[in-house]
Interface confidence: low
């Protein structure tokens, strides 16, 4: 019977301290005279003093009140001795259970909490969780068992009982439908939380609900009907903008207009963009319209948003109709580029070619040609009929004017409308190579010994095209063969010249005679200068001196 | 460009109702919120309140028995009404609209202000 | 309601040289589900309106120059103004809008030193 039930105390007792709470006896007492002894956490080790035991009655003492939110369980050890100290019991366990007072108010973990809901959702919908604590205790007593509630709501539009919180979750969930963003995007909740489950102290905390934007208004046209005018021909021309209103918040996916053209434009002629700012529809031509084919367009034009409707919306629809205003075209060369072989050195006053233009205007203008650009000089165009002659000789070898044998033109066509426009069409003459140009040596200057003399290699060049070129024939005219040689190469594109008597020092002419594969002759005066030397030379050395 | 310009009487008896109008150009009226706020002078800034887009309100809780804001968007208006005036009252107030309708838009925040207007509450 | 408190009430800076304003709130300015601060800083010269500078806390505002700049999270804020201009001398506001009502800071006033 060396044993103690464990003891129960209140929390926060009044005292008066020490308070005696058990007595801890052993009936070892009959025999010897016993003292008694307490160890642990509260006795001898922190928190010391707590607890205490008269020595000799064995009272269990309490010296200060106890605080259950700090210690809830002391477990402490009884001892027995008898005078001369020996241990007369086992040390006994003693349990010291704090109970609990309703001292402490419930705490939110925040003093706002922030969470947000759809508009248009229906009730039922869980919005957030709001959460207090409360330091009591919540397992043997209602001390520490919180209720939550919902003490105001603000704005109370469109009443005051949008939401309700689950009494012991803590959760917020709308309770009633009619969450319209647009009307109310924010709701500000003053919540509560009561221990004792709802009868005991209170605490407050703010939570705000966000309405969330859903896609639960339609965009709708303002104007319905526009008229717009646009001159023909014209791509990329702004038509019209088309004003749209929206109720959803602006720039989300639920107000950014999308627009679609749905009926009217046959030809695809037309486009819709969306302003990313001021959410208009830009409608713009993405060809060019015709006033000769049709001078007038309606078309019809349907807007959504960009993210779907949230319920069965009705779309909203404008009308556009689109006057093609005339404009005096310019005339059109046909082709735009046109290209014509003609032979070089045609006689003056011969005929080219016809080149005209076309005027896309139904009215019967009078369309008047002129030539804009002829860089050598060479044509001239009939101002009525677009006919085009040489006045000029037309130099197939003029490489300050020709490129690749193509001699380009650009010409212009006016029309007599008011005011006047022009075209511009361009003439690419292909000129066909004639025989007018001879080969021609190069170098045509030499230096050559007079004593061993080197072969001197001279090449051929022949401006015309073949085969008006090699093979080459040369020959030596004005005497010129009785001191030199001249012979053309196997594949008959150079000639040799060599000195085949001796010449004393000085310059000479060599007259040589080139002629090309249509026989067309070109007499060159080679400049010789022979010096008194040996073999390869450069130029020729000055007079020996002795010394 | 958006601009707001309050008007209204300059002078309020005690115990009258101040009322003050705002006027919203360069942009569509409904499309943002129009908050109202107030500085007395020499002191710092004051939010009275905020109507939305839809005509849904909030107050300062400390002037909420007191305070009235509404629109009229077929005069791109809207409108103060401060009743049961003190000498307290004396302030420049401001309209000043909304960042943005949407919370990530930084609605609480003011890009645009009017000007000010001083009313004083005098007798 | 959320309190606002700046630091210093005034505070005198040399040309080009960087000022620093404080603004600390009563509970924090931080929300966890977008993890933004709902804090934004104005700029008032006298006989003028506020003008936004900052929003979220750090966001500047368009048209701004980049020498002003906002930092903090949750209860502590500052607003920086790298290289102090003749034009910078002004009362500077900051603001919640965490929860209602929206509350303001009692102003710093900027002076060139």
């Known amino acids: 019977d060396w044993v103690v039930a464990p003891i129960s105390v209140p929390e926060n007792g009044k005292g008066p301290f020490p308070q005696r709470l058990n007595q801890l006896k052993s009936n070892k007492d009959r025999d010897t005279k016993i003292f008694y002894s307490i160890t642990g956490p509260g006795a001898d080790s922190p928190p010391e003093g707590v607890f205490a035991v008269e020595k000799e009655t064995g009272w269990l003492l309490l010296n200060k009140p106890l605080d259950r939110e700090e210690i809830a369980k002391y477990e402490l050890f009884g001892h027995a001795v008898s005078e001369n100290g020996a241990s007369v019991e086992d040390p006994m366990n003693i349990s010291i259970i704090v109970t609990d007072q309703n001292d402490h108010k419930p705490k939110f973990t925040q003093d706002t909490f922030r969470g947000s809901v759809l508009e248009g959702v229906l009730p039922g919908t869980s919005v957030m969780q709001v959460t207090a604590t409360d330091e009591d205790d919540a397992i043997y007593t209602y001390n520490g068992v919180v209720a939550y509630s919902i003490h105001s709501q603000e704005p109370k539009d469109p009443h005051d009982l949008m939401f309700t919180i689950h009494r012991s979750t803590g959760t917020i969930s709308v309770i009633s439908s009619g969450l319209d963003r647009e009307k109310v995007p924010e709701y500000t909740l003053t919540i509560q939380a009561t221990d004792m489950d709802g009868d005991g102290s209170t605490t407050t905390a703010v939570a705000v609900v966000e309405i969330l934007d859903a896609n639960d208004n339609a965009p709708m046209f303002d104007p319905q009907k526009y008229e717009a005018h646009v001159p023909e021909n014209a791509v990329g021309h702004e038509v019209q903008r088309l004003t749209v209103t929206d109720l959803d918040a602006p720039n989300s996916p639920a107000w950014r207009a999308t627009y679609l053209i749905m009926g009217g434009d046959d030809g695809d002629h037309f486009t819709i963009t969306t302003h990313p700012e001021s959410n208009q529809g830009i409608l713009t031509t993405r060809k060019g319209l015709d006033f000769e084919a049709k001078n007038q367009h309606t078309l019809y034009v349907e807007v959504t948003n960009e993210a779907p409707f949230v319920l069965k919306l009705p779309t909203s629809t404008a009308t556009i109709v689109v006057h093609v205003e005339d404009v005096n075209e310019a005339p059109v060369f046909v082709p735009p580029s046109k290209v014509v072989e003609v032979q070089e050195g045609i006689p003056t006053g011969e005929p080219v070619c016809v080149y005209t233009a076309e005027d896309p205007d139904k009215e019967n203008q009078k369309i008047s040609y002129r030539i804009l650009r002829d860089p050598a000089g060479w044509l001239a165009m009939d101002p009525d009929s677009g006919q085009v002659t040489a006045v000029g000789t037309l130099d197939r070898e003029d490489e300050q004017f020709v490129r690749n044998n193509i001699y380009e033109v650009m010409v212009l066509a006016m029309d007599n409308g008011s005011p006047p426009t022009t075209g511009t069409g361009t003439l690419l003459l292909t000129l066909i190579d004639v025989n007018d140009h001879g080969p021609v040596p190069e170098p045509r200057q030499i230096t050559i010994c007079n004593q061993s003399p080197v072969r001197q290699v001279l090449n051929i060049t022949d401006k015309d095209l073949s085969p008006h070129t090699s093979p080459f024939q040369a020959q030596l005219t004005d005497d010129s063969d009785i001191y030199w040689t001249a012979e053309v190469n196997e594949e008959g594109d150079t000639v040799v010249l060599s000195l085949k008597k001796f010449l004393k020092q000085d310059t000479y002419d060599v007259h040589l005679s080139l002629s090309d594969h249509g026989n067309k002759e070109q007499l060159t005066v080679i400049r010789a200068t022979v010096c008194d030397c040996h073999g390869h030379v450069e130029t020729c050395p000055g007079p020996w001196k002795g010394g | 460009q958006v601009q707001l310009q309050e008007s209204g009487p300059g002078l309020v008896k005690p115990s009258e109702t101040l009322s003050l109008t705002c006027t919203v150009s360069g942009g569509s009226i409904t499309s943002y919120p129009i908050n109202w706020i107030r500085q007395p002078p020499g002191k710092g800034l004051e939010w009275i309140g905020v109507?939305?887009?839809?005509?849904?309100?909030n107050y300062n809780p400390s002037l909420k028995s007191r305070v009235t804001i509404s629109v009229d968007t077929s005069k791109n208006q809207f409108s103060l009404k401060l009743s049961s005036v003190t000498a307290a009252d004396t302030a420049v107030y401001y309209c000043?609209?909304?960042?943005?309708?949407?919370?990530?838009?930084?609605?609480?925040?003011?890009?645009?202000w009017g000007q000010g207007t001083l009313v004083t509450v005098s007798s | 309601d959320i309190v606002m408190t700046q630091s210093p009430d005034s505070l005198a800076v040399s040309l080009g040289e960087r000022a620093t304003i404080n603004c600390k709130s009563s509970?924090?300015?931080?929300?966890?589900?977008?993890?933004?601060?709902?804090l934004a800083w104005y700029q008032q010269k006298p006989g003028q309106p506020p003008k936004l500078l900052i929003y979220?806390?750090?966001t500047r505002e368009s048209g701004v120059p980049d020498r002003f700049s906002g930092s903090g999270s949750g209860t502590d804020f500052t607003l920086t103004i790298s290289s102090l201009q003749a034009e910078d001398v002004a009362v500077y506001y900051c603001q919640q809008y965490y929860s209602y009502p929206y509350t303001f800071g009692q102003g710093t006033k900027l002076e060139i030193k």
């Open positions: 109507i939305w887009t839809g005509g849904g309100t």
């Open positions: 000043a609209r909304s960042r943005g309708v949407y919370d990530f838009d930084g609605r609480g925040a003011m890009d645009y």
């Open positions: 979220w806390a750090s």
């Open positions: 509970q924090s300015l931080l929300y966890s589900s977008n993890q933004k601060n709902y």
